[in-house]
């Protein structure tokens, strides 16, 4: 019989229910914004905003300082007081909409939903390894601001994204705000603007450049700004907005907006549609060509990538890539495919596509019917004409006006749908060694740290653990401080090591020592841990073999048994070739001689499942006793594998040596032509791996085998005669003298 070891699912080598406790801070209210600061002299801080309060934490997440940012009109509001005697506007709570660092000063800038969305600047004061906030400066000059023109009105209650860029001695705030008719009518925030911070920090310089959704579209056309970042010569905003000004406003898609970071101008404002799809390897009938679209961006982060992912994306190591988590719609509800997909857009490629789009619009030959787009910001026009004009005048350049690039940038899910039901709500990507890791927060309050790699059909987890017991969604914004990431969930901020929270979720030595080097995992006798967790027995260089099962569970005391051992860490080499003298198997007192691997039986094992098999021939010693005993596998002197060498012993109970006994055979005669159904009765007749009933030396074909009974069909007889009948188990004869009589047919 050809018995095969059962597959062990890959998931059995890890346990994602292992509890990890990471440092946390309770903010006393829903966390609205968070940003980190690392100074030149080893000082660092975490700034956490909740309604009406701004917390300053040390690198250990202990509170250093707390500032009242509201309610507006309340005498205790410390930021409001910086604007001098009030009233400055209607009283009300302050929800922090913007929390950014101005690295030039350095200073923290916070802008809230109260006081017309004005901002406050807090200089940073290092105190040892901690940082304190200096008193806030009110970035608002009353005499410069009117409801219809307010350079100091920055934050929209509907959401604002800000990226600060240093140009010369000045700080420029690249601001993108969500608007509706009501917000637009109140102190006129703009959709996209570039504002210069005045040198004396009394506000922003008037006369700034801006784009805004035109009044006629404000009711139906809303733009959500999901993320903003600065890399190279540009600032980028990522938006979710209606695909068309004229069609169904609920049909959304994702765009990237690009602005110059070197010139505070909006003439070279460009937009590009980002298209992310799930394209399963085997397309279902009726599934869309090119994959299922996931048009709505949920979270995004840009980061340089490691060597492996760079190769897969056909870019150079260390190049910046924009990663986005996309869902099928605003509610992110279940569709046919996974709930969340992750797409990667190399920044250089984005820029090339944008530049090519500008060429198409502005260079001869003119493509007829090519629209400039952005009709929600500007008057409609065809390329190469400026907005609202029929033709280019000699002194205007086609390139000096905002443009929507006519082609989109399409990518497919890096994870091949493997995120399945997981709803990702936060994303931060880091490069560790040559590995690119996505650190993801989820709707149910978990952190997934997964290697970003395209070519696999399973996820390579660094970790997958629950942040706490609340199960509240992890919030969109993630910050890095040293070797840690800060995630917010509910009213808590959690500090998660980028190397993962620990190693205890790896259950086997092999899985433990195959973990990424940066995780610092080692084997501690019977668990996976970091060196500080078990200094005594911690090691990273070898694993003992692990027996999980064997077959058969019994064998004859006399005669041989072909024993198949199942488990892991037998070989470390896919071929399963065993160097001479490295593997020693004993069953009880008896040796089991290793058998060469039958190459015809080698079958590819997908990494998602794993099992190793080892076969040996068991010949019991004369001194071996009947009864239960252990199977022991000892591996020594094995050459090291890629991650570790195999060394040690594994013992498994449950093998029994038995003595087969033949009690009865019937019938004792049959026709010479053969085919008589013989029944042999006895005990322990099924032990071992081989048995044979011989009638006059010729095998009687076994039809059924059980512990107490064998059925076989007699072979044809040469003549009418009484012939010897014997039973062999494991090649050894079972005691007893039996005959079978061939008669005439």
């Amino acid at each position: 019989e050809d018995w095969q070891c059962p597959r062990t699912p890959y998931a059995a080598s890890r346990d994602f229910d292992v509890k990890y406790v990471v440092p946390s801070f309770s903010a006393g209210g829903l966390v609205q914004a968070m940003v980190t600061y690392e100074g030149d002299r080893n000082e660092s801080a975490v700034f956490v905003a909740i309604r009406n309060r701004l917390h300053v934490l040390g690198p250990d997440l202990k509170s250093v300082q707390s500032l009242a940012t509201g309610p507006a009109g309340d005498p205790g509001c410390q930021t409001c007081a910086a604007c001098g005697p009030g009233p400055h506007g209607p009283p009300g709570d302050t929800d922090t909409k913007v929390l950014v660092l101005d690295p030039a000063l350095p200073a923290l800038v916070s802008c809230g939903s109260s006081l017309q969305g004005r901002c406050f600047l807090h200089d940073l004061e290092p105190q040892g390894t901690a940082v304190h906030l200096a008193a806030p400066a009110c970035l608002f000059s009353a005499h410069h601001n009117r409801p219809d023109d307010c350079p100091d009105c920055v934050a929209s209650p509907l959401g604002t994204r800000v990226t600060v860029v240093e140009q010369g001695q000045a700080s420029y705030f690249y601001v993108a705000s969500s608007l509706d008719a009501a917000v637009a009518a109140s102190f006129s925030p703009r959709s996209v603007s570039i504002r210069r911070l005045k040198a004396d920090a009394s506000g922003f310089a008037p006369g700034f450049v801006a784009l805004s959704v035109l009044p006629k579209h404000l009711v139906s056309y809303s733009i959500e700004y999901v993320h903003s970042f600065h890399t190279g010569a540009f600032v980028y905003f990522l938006t979710v907005q209606p695909a068309s000004v004229t069609d169904d406003p609920s049909a959304l898609h994702t765009r990237l907006a690009r602005l110059s970071a070197t010139e505070p101008e909006l003439g070279d404002y460009r937009e590009l549609v980002l298209d992310c799809r799930f394209a399963p390897k085997r397309r279902r009938r009726g599934a869309p060509e090119g994959g299922q679209p996931y048009p709505v961006l949920r979270v995004a982060h840009s980061a340089p990538v490691g060597a492996q992912l760079a190769t897969e994306l056909s870019i150079a190591e260390g190049q910046e890539v924009l990663f986005g988590v996309f869902v099928t719609g605003k509610d992110g509800g279940p569709g046919v495919g996974p709930n969340s997909v992750v797409c990667a857009f190399p920044i250089d490629l984005l820029d090339t596509l944008i530049d090519e789009g500008v060429e198409r619009c502005c260079e001869s030959p003119v493509h007829p019917g090519l629209r400039r787009g952005l009709d929600f910001f500007q008057s409609p026009s065809f390329c190469p004409n400026p907005p609202g004009l029929e033709a280019l005048s000699p002194n205007t350049s086609c390139r000096h006006f905002p443009l929507l690039v006519s082609s989109s940038f399409s990518r497919v899910d890096l994870f091949n749908g493997l995120l399945g039901p997981v709803q990702v709500t936060a994303l931060y990507v880091t490069r560790l060694d040559n590995v690119t890791v996505a650190h993801m927060g989820t709707m149910d309050g978990r952190i997934l740290q997964v290697e970003l790699v395209r070519s696999l059909n399973y996820l390579l987890y660094v970790s997958n653990f629950s942040l706490g017991d609340s199960g509240q969604p992890v919030q969109r914004d993630v910050s890095r401080l040293g070797d840690h990431l800060l995630f917010a969930s509910g009213d808590q901020v959690f500090q998660v090591p980028i190397q993962g929270p620990g190693c205890r979720h790896f259950l086997t030595c092999g899985r433990c020592l195959r973990a990424w080097h940066f995780m610092g995992c080692g084997w501690c006798g019977n668990m996976c841990g970091q060196q500080k967790e078990c200094p005594g027995s911690w090691q990273q260089d070898h694993c003992p073999p692990k027996l999980t099962e064997f077959h058969p569970h019994s064998g004859p005391l006399r005669g041989s048994t072909r024993l198949t051992l199942c488990g892991s860490n037998f070989y470390l080499h896919p071929s399963g070739l065993v160097p001479e003298g490295t593997h020693q198997v004993t069953v009880g007192q008896s040796p089991c001689r290793p058998l060469p691997k039958d190459s015809s039986k080698l079958r590819p094992v997908p990494r998602k499942d794993f099992v190793e098999e080892f076969e040996c021939e068991l010949e019991p010693l004369g001194t071996q006793a009947v009864g239960p005993t252990n199977v022991s596998l000892t591996v020594t002197n094995m050459p090291p594998g890629k991650h570790f060498r195999v060394d040690g012993t594994s013992v498994l109970r449950g093998f029994s040596f038995m003595e087969p006994v033949l009690i009865a055979v019937q019938p004792l005669f049959g026709p010479r032509a053969g085919g008589t159904c013989l029944t042999l009765e006895g005990q322990s007749l099924s032990v071992g791996t081989s048995r044979a009933v011989l009638v006059n030396g010729t095998e009687c074909l076994l039809a059924r085998v059980s512990e107490g009974q064998l059925l076989c069909a007699t072979p044809p007889g040469a003549t009418v005669a009484s012939v010897p009948l014997s039973l062999q188990v494991g090649g050894a004869q079972v005691p007893g003298s039996w005959t079978f009589q061939y008669r005439e047919d």
């Epitope: 410390q78 910086a82 001098g84 400066a137 004396d200």
Partner: antibody, heavy 121, light 107 residues
Framework: EVQLVESGGGLVQPGGSLRLSCAAS????????MSWVRQAPGKGLEWVSE????????NYTPSLKERFTISRDNAKNSLYLQMNSLRAEDTAVYYC??????????????WGQGTTVTVSS | DIVLTQSQKIVSTSVGARVSVTCKAS??????LVWYQQKPGQSPKTLIY???FRYSGVPDRFTGSGSGTDFTLTISNVQSEDLADYFC?????????FGAGTKLELK
């Protein structure tokens, strides 16, 4: 380390003039508002004048505006106070002071040791 | 002009005690108030600005509080080196104005 060193004080007759100087070092002078503050013998402090980094914004205490002129030379890291038509009540120690950072309008964080002006006949 | 009144001309205290110095503004100055310490023959030193923010390097036994028109400088656990004149100054309106000062002396 921030250092402000005043000079130019001395004895002057009523109606006379003096020009006080303040040499700054240890910080980016061109980014800070600077002030003059005086203290009459045995009395409290009195703010005199201030000037913004690019000399475009200048403020005085109203009673001194006609007689005193504040100026600065960022290239030389220097602050000046030109005092004309001096009176006996202008007798005081004159301090040069730097504003707290670049944006807290009138809070001073660094002061010179002062230079004494005596107006007497 | 905004008048700042420091009603206590002299406050007597002992080492280790807790003492408060007050300053009252003739009109609302928000939190735009600074406290200075001046020892005889020396120039003033900034202690607290924006009413409650301790200037860097100032010991944490100095605490500022108040907003609007009423402000207090509190020194807990007074040390002998704290004996000096204390001035408040508002910077909410021009001209910038100072209080007349409060002298802290040993009983």
């Amino acid at each position: 380390e921030v250092q402000l060193v005043e000079s130019g004080g001395g004895l002057v007759q009523p109606g006379g003039s003096l020009r006080l100087s303040c040499a700054a070092s240890g910080f980016d002078f061109s980014r800070h508002w600077m002030s003059w503050v005086r203290q009459a013998p045995g009395k409290g402090l009195e703010w005199v004048s201030e000037i913004n980094p690019d000399s475009r914004t200048i403020n005085y205490t109203p009673s001194l505006k006609e007689r005193f002129t504040i100026s600065r030379d960022n290239a030389k890291n220097s602050l000046y106070l030109q005092m004309n038509s001096l009176r006996a009540e202008d007798t005081a120690v004159y301090y040069c002071a730097r504003r707290v950072r670049i944006h807290y309008y009138g809070a001073m964080d660094s002061w010179g040791q002062g230079t004494t002006v005596t107006v007497s006949s | 002009d905004i008048v700042l009144t420091q009603s206590q001309k002299i406050v007597s205290t002992s080492v280790g005690a807790r003492v408060s110095v007050t300053c009252k503004a003739s009109q609302n100055v928000g939190s735009s108030l600074v406290w200075y310490q001046q020892k005889p023959g020396q120039s003033p030193k900034t202690l607290i600005y924006s009413a409650s923010f301790r200037y860097s390097g100032v010991p944490d036994r100095f605490t500022g509080s108040g907003s609007g028109t009423d402000f207090t400088l509190t020194i807990s656990n007074v040390q002998s080196e704290d004996l000096a004149d204390y001035f408040c100054q508002q910077y909410n309106n021009y001209p910038l104005t100072f209080g007349a000062g409060t002298k802290l002396e040993l009983k």
